[in-house]
């Protein structure tokens, strides 16, 4: 049950990213750290970098509400038990500032890519009976 809910939440984050991609022109065109080709065991660290990034609505009015709600939902913190190997490897993972900075469109695309990778890994670990999530 908990594992299923975890997967639903991760997929939900992809849906939120997809919704925000519809509004890239309404986001502040700021360059944000956007992890790519994240090394194994640093996925949760990179995930945390995406969540910390200051993605913001440009307050143009029309879609401000849905953008702000979506950004806030993107920052929902998973329980630490879901961080898998994060604790063990945190010290060896790149800092958020070390990742290449990208505008909102590419930032969201890279976030989606990471989420997809994490979902794939999660499913694989379940298939192979691993404890990691």
């Amino acid at each position: 049950q908990g594992q299923d809910r975890h997967m639903i939440r991760m997929r939900q984050l992809i849906d939120i990213v997809d919704q925000l991609k519809n509004y890239v022109n309404d986001l502040v065109p700021e360059f944000l750290p956007a992890p790519e080709d994240v090394e194994t065991n640093c996925e949760w660290s990179a995930f945390s970098c995406f969540q910390k990034a200051q993605l913001k609505s440009a307050n143009t009015g029309n879609n401000e509400r849905i953008i702000n709600v979506s950004i806030k939902k993107l920052k929902r913190k998973p329980p630490s038990t879901n961080a898998g190997r994060r604790q063990k490897h945190r010290l060896t993972c790149p800092s958020c500032d070390s990742y290449e900075k990208k505008p909102p469109k590419e930032f969201l695309e890279r976030f989606k890519s990471l989420l997809q990778k994490m979902i794939h890994q999660h499913l694989s670990s379940r298939t192979h009976g691993s404890e990691d999530s």
Epitope: H6, Q12, D15, D18, Q19, R65, I66, V69, S70, R76
Partner: antibody, heavy 126, light 106 residues
């Protein structure tokens, strides 16, 4: 069982104020965002306001912005709608509704309003 | 702000028939953000479908939702007497409702 009960409706003159309450029971109120939705006589549904589960963010429909204030008291499991400078066009049945997306990672995940109260009627008339 | 346009305004059908309700958005909506509600006279609305196609708890399987982008559909495969009501689509996050489709007995 999961329940929302609104109160505080009534007849009020234009320009006056009214405060609606919504008592929640049967669920962890502090884990859910909450909405007010209204329905004028013979009309469709109109979203009015939303408050985040912890009260940290509030959103309003343009038609009520600056006049209505949504708030909550998680210790009392109660949602409020303070309505000031009331107008004839505010006449409606007011519903409180639970947002189906829980703040809990393992909680409910519905992007919709999954629990509704029975509604309380507000009539603005001189 | 997004506008949701429902059609038809009224659908006159007989019990046992299939009902197809449309909801068109003025800009693209992620499927996760589209919900459908049912409202009967004198009652509060009830969540039917969330995520464009997932039935809410306790909703019979004769109700189904589909669509993506700007076009969404609610289908009632065989109308039961209790299904005659008004149906609303909604975009989550902006919480905008469509104007509603009334399904009435022919």
């Amino acid at each position: 069982q999961v329940q929302l009960v609104e109160s505080g409706g009534g007849v009020v003159q234009p320009g006056r104020s009214l405060r609606l309450s919504c008592a929640a029971s049967g669920f962890t109120f502090s884990s859910y965002g909450m909405h007010w939705v209204r329905q004028a006589p013979g009309k469709g549904l109109e979203w009015v306001a939303f408050i985040w589960y912890d009260g940290s963010d509030k959103y309003y429909a343009d038609s009520v912005k600056g006049r209505f204030t949504i708030s909550r008291d998680n210790s009392k499991n109660t949602l409020y709608l303070q309505m000031n400078s009331l107008r004839a066009e505010d006449t409606a049945v007011y519903y409180c509704a639970r947002d189906g997306d829980s703040s809990d990672w393992y909680g409910d995940y519905y992007f919709g309003m999954d629990v509704w109260g029975q509604g309380t009627t507000v009539t603005v008339s001189s | 702000e997004i506008v949701l346009t429902q059609s038809p305004g009224t659908l006159s059908l007989s019990p046992g028939e299939r009902a197809t309700l449309s909801c068109r958005a003025s800009q693209s909506v992620s499927s996760s953000y589209l919900a459908w509600y049912q409202q009967k006279p004198g009652q509060a609305p009830r969540l039917l479908i969330y995520g464009a196609s997932t039935r809410a708890t306790g909703i019979p399987d004769r109700f189904s939702g589909s669509g993506s982008g700007t076009d969404f559909t609610l289908t009632i495969s065989r109308l039961e007497p209790e299904d005659f009501a008004v149906y609303y689509c909604q975009q989550y996050g902006s919480w905008t409702f469509g104007q509603g489709t009334k399904v009435e007995i022919k």
